[in-house]
Interface confidence: medium
């Protein structure tokens, strides 16, 4: 594993699973507050590859509710507001870290988990396969 | 604080900051392996709102490398392959959870942190402000 120069003020973990199990401070630091970005919340309707948001709930996970983007059309919206099937709406996917209670129902023990979520959709030129 | 029906196998936290500090197992469970999704790795070039990927590295953070999307153009690529400035390329942003070593350089002590990343770009109809 990785060797890290040790800070003398580090907490000492006696856990037999160390370094697999670590202490995590849940007082979440939000690095976004200074930049205060414009939420992308209206893009789902204004995009040429618009999407709907679907709810996925799991009470043993943080965050418990995840909204998944599903592209509305196979094609993309053209200048006339019609669906153009010569282009494709595709989901942009991202892996995110979530926390899962483990063992279940334990208030202070979690496992880090990676899940794939669709964040939104983009319009792409299709890959055309020519048959000989 | 909250009362949770306690699993008899739960680890017991004697930490004075509980429940702000919890144990997290870093042996990451990846929920994506079975689904084997088609990666969106070529979409950044094929999109009508193409983007470049920039590497953001921070050894005090997990994951230490995060790829950030930056839209290539203000407008979108039209059918002729030219940039159409009547449409806008915009980043689709997502908050992700990361772990930050705290205190710095401690191998087994982290704080949960939220950071905003741009995952890709989508093409949207602009909001036109009419001046009276």
């Amino acid at each position: 594993g990785i060797t890290i120069p040790r800070n003398p003020g580090c907490p000492n973990s006696e856990d037999k699973n160390f370094p697999r199990t670590v202490m995590v401070n849940l007082n979440i630091h939000n690095r976004n507050t200074n930049t205060n970005p414009k939420r992308s919340s209206d893009y789902y309707n204004r995009s040429t590859s618009p999407w709907n948001l679907h709810r996925n709930e799991d009470p043993e996970r943080y965050p418990s509710v995840i909204w998944e983007a599903k592209c509305r059309h196979l094609g993309c919206i053209n200048a006339d507001g019609n669906v153009d099937y010569h282009m494709n709406s595709v989901p942009i996917q991202q892996e995110i870290l979530v926390l899962r209670r483990e063992p279940p129902h334990c208030p202070n023990s979690f496992r880090l988990e990676k899940i794939l979520v669709s964040v939104g959709c983009t319009c792409v030129t299709p890959i055309v396969h020519h048959v000989a | 604080g909250i009362t949770i029906p306690r699993n008899p196998g739960c680890p017991n936290s004697e930490d004075k900051n509980f429940p702000r500090t919890v144990m997290v197992n870093l042996n990451i469970h990846n929920r994506n392996t079975n689904t084997n999704p088609k990666r969106s790795s070529d979409y950044y070039n094929r999109s009508t709102s193409p983007w470049n990927l920039h590497r953001n590295e921070d050894p005090e953070r997990y994951p230490s490398v995060i790829w950030e999307a930056k839209c290539r153009h203000l407008g979108c690529i039209n059918a002729d392959g030219n940039v159409d400035y009547h449409m806008n390329s915009v980043p689709i942003q997502q908050e992700i959870l990361v772990l930050r070593r705290e205190p710095p350089h401690c191998p087994n002590s982290f704080r949960l942190e939220k950071i905003l990343v741009s995952v890709g770009c989508t093409c949207v109809t602009p909001i036109v402000h009419h001046v009276a």
């Epitope: 970005p37 414009k38 939420r39 995840i66 | -």
Partner: antibody, heavy 126, light 107 residues
Amino acid sequence: EVQLVQSGAEVKKPGESVKISCKASGGSFRSYGISWVRQAPGQGLEWMGGITHFFGITDYAQKFQGRVTITADESTTTAYMELSGLTSDDTAVYYCAREPNDFWNGYYDTHDFDSWGQGTTVTVSS
Amino acid sequence: EIVLTQSPDFQSVTPKEKVTITCRASQNIGSELHWYQQKPDQSPKLLIKYASHSISGVPSRFSGSGSGTDFTLTINGLEAEDAATYYCHQSDTLPHTFGQGTKVDIK
């Protein structure tokens, strides 16, 4: 559809404490937080504090720090708000409100109050 | 704390008229602004979340716009049942804060 049902009206004397309950039904209790908001007669809404069920973390408005305690019991899906050192200024309707714990449209945690209890009237009078 | 200032404080409107209520934040709050309707002796009800997102079950005549510091709630074609007090609420920074409210009544 989540429903929040609060305990009944209370009449208290100055210096006493009041504890109000908020029973949730319909939906997973751990999938949201509960905030407490009060409204003095003829006045606007004032946030007192809230609890994030998933981690059991509480946050309080500075004005109420040290006087308010918010707790929750997952086994009964009930949240509680206790306010001590009551004065006549604490006469108000107290509401519990659901705060979803969502990863919504690419963002962790939503903070709108999408469901409210019916309110509990607390009267403080000597 | 972030201060939200609503205007006007009071509005008397004829049915079918368009109503516009504004909410100004003392600092940039992105789109972390929500609108509620409260009728006499009732609990508040969520109308719009995140500045412009409509809520299932809320009539389409209610809409929201704005970002940063300036936000607007619009009622397109007021109906008698819309007589209520309307509050804006910011969730960008703790503590959550509310505007002072705008009372809308029917002429």
